[in-house]
């Protein structure tokens, strides 16, 4: 039975040109994490495999850094980076757990004035 839950940073905002950490945390299970995928709906950004280590997709190599931990750091953000990001935890024996983060990349001046994007 799958008892675990994924906690994520939820809906977050960052400013254009800056960086952001995408973070998920799996709790309430003793299952062993064998791999974590970081994905957008139609492309894979990175994989952290327990045996093989990190793999960053070539199209993101310049702007994505592994970590901290099982998280992912996005750098040199552009407005086009706005959207959904998914962490997919592969575990044994439970199976897969998934979490969602929505990132809004704001123009610098907007971000400076403390605006924050929230999905109701």
């Amino acid at each position: 039975m799958m008892t675990g839950t994924i906690e994520t940073t939820g809906n977050i905002s960052a400013e254009k040109g800056g960086s952001i950490i995408l973070q998920c945390h799996l709790s309430s299970t003793t299952a062993q994490v064998t791999q974590v995928n970081w994905e957008q709906q139609d492309q894979l950004l990175a994989i952290c495999n327990a045996d093989l280590g990190w793999h960053i997709s070539p199209s993101f190599k310049d702007r994505v850094a592994p970590g901290p931990g099982l998280g992912l750091t996005l750098q040199s953000l552009t407005v086009n980076d706005t959207g959904e990001y998914f962490c997919i935890y592969h575990t044994y024996p439970d199976g897969t757990y998934t979490g969602r983060i929505f990132l809004e990349v704001l123009e610098s001046s907007v971000a400076e004035h403390g605006a924050r994007f929230q999905i109701p």
Partner: antibody, heavy 121, light 107 residues
Framework: QVQLVQSGAEVKKPGASVKVSCKAS????????IEWVRQAPGQGLEWIGV????????NYNEKFKGRATITADKSTSTAYMELSSLRSEDTAVYFC??????????????WGQGTTVTVSS | DIVMTQSQRFMSTTVGDRVSITCKAS??????VAWYQQKPGQSPKLLIY???NRYTGVPDRFTGSGSGTDFTLTISNMQSEDLADFFC?????????FGGGTKLEIK
């Protein structure tokens, strides 16, 4: 339990269009992406495209862009794939499929039974 | 597009055999490969995802391995009900692409 039930076989003339339906049940339709894949007689599998039924957002295989249109009707939990300007090479079994997880990777855990489309003059 | 190549279109086997079906990706796809089984007149059935993760309800005689560009599906104790076509698929990038399939036949 999760079920994807597709419409029946179709026979079409070259140049015509076909619209295949895929009715989903047993889960929250808007929460999971629906993919379309085809298989020509005796051949492998070919991915056509995907729809997010919640937002209506789509992504297509470049090969089918402009000819394939994928839509979803939330009120009936049904996804559709329309293919226009049919040619004989489009003769195939068309499948709808669903990813295994709500936000999961693009591996397909649930499949419709397939719809045979025959294009013949 | 990423090309998935299954070099053996047909493989002959016997009940009880250990069978290995291979698949090669045209570029590094890390561990983003799934395997499907398809019997005549049926829809494909998911066996393995992310190279080595067995899907729910799949018998443990089916094992996936590999990373990068080379992947293998192994059936450790071939059963008559395993006779089918087997396809690999990359779930690394769009468009999703499949191998041409490997058909298992009885010797």
């Amino acid at each position: 339990q999760v079920q994807l039930v597709q419409s029946g076989a179709e026979v079409k003339k070259p140049g015509a269009s076909v619209k295949v339906s895929c009715k989903a049940s047993g889960y929250a339709f808007t929460n999971y992406l629906i993919e379309w894949v085809r298989q020509a007689p005796g051949q492998g599998l070919e991915w056509i495209g995907v729809i997010n039924p919640g937002s209506g957002g789509t992504n297509y295989n470049e090969k089918f862009k402009g000819r394939a249109t994928i839509t979803a009707d939330k009120s009936t939990s049904t996804a559709y794939m329309e293919l226009s300007s049919l040619r004989s090479e489009d003769t195939a079994v068309y499948f709808c499929a669903r990813r295994g997880d709500k936000y999961g990777s693009a591996w397909f855990a649930y499949w419709g039974q397939g719809t045979t489309v025959t294009v013949s003059s | 597009d990423i090309v998935m190549t299954q070099s053996q279109r047909f493989m002959s086997t016997t009940v009880g055999d250990r069978v290995s079906i291979t698949c090669k990706a045209s570029q590094d796809v890390s561990t983003a490969v799934a395997w499907y089984q398809q019997k005549p007149g049926q829809s494909p059935k998911l066996l393995i995802y992310s190279a080595s993760n067995r899907y729910t309800g799949v018998p443990d005689r089916f094992t996936g391995s590999g990373s990068g560009t080379d992947f293998t599906l192994t059936i450790s104790n071939m059963q008559s009900e395993d006779l089918a076509d087997f396809f690999c698929q990359q779930h690394y990038s769009s468009p999703r692409t499949f191998g041409g399939g490997t058909k298992l036949e009885i010797k």
